[in-house]
């Protein structure tokens, strides 16, 4: 089975760890795919190791373990992320995470200070 946090949040400009945990008494992991909606983020293969898609190569770091560290987050990174574990002989297992990227607290504080500043 796949165990994961279904909903996570992080600040714009910050980083977040995307993690799925696979547990099985018999099946061994041969490949793990990470996708943002339909688009490949990264793949881990027992044979060849990690590959991060070119479009994310400056912001996605493999690990910890079979998870990903997603850096320099933007509001556009909000959305669904999917991990797919290919196992033998167990088959394919999928997990889903919803990431909400929020405006950074600095921006929020700055906005609040601006709004309460006296006019004139």
């Amino acid at each position: 089975t796949i165990d994961t946090k279904r909903n996570i949040s992080a600040e714009e400009g910050g980083s977040v760890i995307l993690q799925c945990h696979f547990s099985s008494d018999t099946a061994e992991v041969t490949q793990v795919d990470w996708k943002q909606q339909d688009q490949l983020l990264a793949i881990y293969s027992v044979d060849l190791g990690w590959h991060v898609a070119s479009v994310f190569s400056d912001r996605v770091v493999p690990g910890p373990s079979l998870g990903l560290t997603f850096q320099s987050l933007t509001m556009n990174d909000t959305g669904e992320y999917f991990c797919t574990y290919h196992t033998y002989p167990g088959g394919i297992y999928k997990g889903r995470i919803f990431l909400k990227v929020q405006e950074s607290s600095d921006d929020r504080n700055g906005l609040a200070q601006f709004q309460t500043a006296p006019l004139g």
């Epitope: 490949q31 293969s45 990690w50 590959h51 991060v52 898609a53 070119s54 190569s57 770091v61």
Partner: antibody, heavy 115, light 110 residues
Framework: QVQLESEGGLFKPTDTLTLTCTVS????????MSWVRQAPGKGLEWIGI?????NTYYANWAKGRFTISKTSTTVELKITSPTTEDTATYFC????????????WGPGTLVTVSS | DIVMTQTPASVEVAVGGTVTIKCQAS??????LNWYQQKPGQPPKLLIY???KLASGVPSRFSGSGSGTEYTLTISGVESADAATYYC????????????FGGGTEVVVK
């Protein structure tokens, strides 16, 4: 942006031929890299792939005579005992095994083997 | 040993017409199938990945379909700029293969 560059030239059959693909904008510690060649007027021919962990796979016909290796910023293709049939444009490309395609590609480098 | 058979080897199409290129794998490749366009003197350019997804910046007149062993690239409303050679590539397996690419299809636009 990922950029790939490589260089070739004119070689003799007695030479050991080494092509180097320089990678910038992406870490080879999290990249699969493939080598593909194309003889003049012919189709694309896959040579092999190297994983981020250094493991390699080769086309059946390339096993033994072709060797792919890498450093922190380059990927190399070594051809021992080249023949005139190895005359081709050689491309390096990022990805190639369940990576949603090979992309980007280097511009290619022409290797001519002649005695 | 997965073998990719691409047909036809060459096809002629009028501007505005539709061209269909087929690629058959000798065993199921589970949609690990990509299409490339190559023009003379240039490296291949990724068009379609995972059988049906359009690569970034590729016009919507290009489309891919298929599953299992049978895959198709379709170019609708062909433009003169589409004159090129097209290749399919399987990414299902890199062990015990002679070539991951199909033989190519030359598209001539008249």
């Amino acid at each position: 942006q990922v950029q790939l560059e490589s260089e070739g030239g004119l070689f003799k059959p007695t030479d050991t031929l080494t092509l180097t693909c320089t990678v910038s904008g992406s870490s080879l510690s999290s990249s699969y890299m493939s080598w593909v060649r194309q003889a003049p007027g012919k189709g694309l021919e896959w040579i092999g792939i190297i994983g981020s962990n250094g493991n390699t796979y080769y086309a059946n016909w390339a096993k033994g005579r072709f060797t792919i290796s890498k450093t922190s910023t380059t990927v190399e293709l070594k051809i021992t005992s080249p023949t005139t049939e190895d005359t081709a444009t050689y491309f390096c490309a990022r990805g190639g095994y369940r990576t949603s395609g090979m992309d980007p590609w280097g511009p290619g480098t022409l290797v001519t083997v002649s005695s | 040993d997965i073998v990719m058979t691409q047909t036809p080897a060459s096809v002629e199409v009028a501007v505005g017409g539709t061209v269909t290129i087929k690629c058959q794998a000798s065993q199921s490749i589970s949609s690990y199938l990509n299409w490339y366009q190559q023009k003379p003197g240039q490296p291949p350019k990724l068009l379609i990945y995972d059988a049906l997804k359009l690569a970034s910046g590729v016009p919507s007149r290009f489309s891919g379909s298929g599953s299992g062993t049978e895959y198709t690239l379709t170019i609708s409303g062909v433009e003169s700029a589409d004159a090129a050679t097209y290749y399919c590539q399987q990414e299902h397996s890199v062990g015990n293969v002679d070539n991951v690419f199909g033989g190519g299809t030359e598209v001539v636009v008249k």
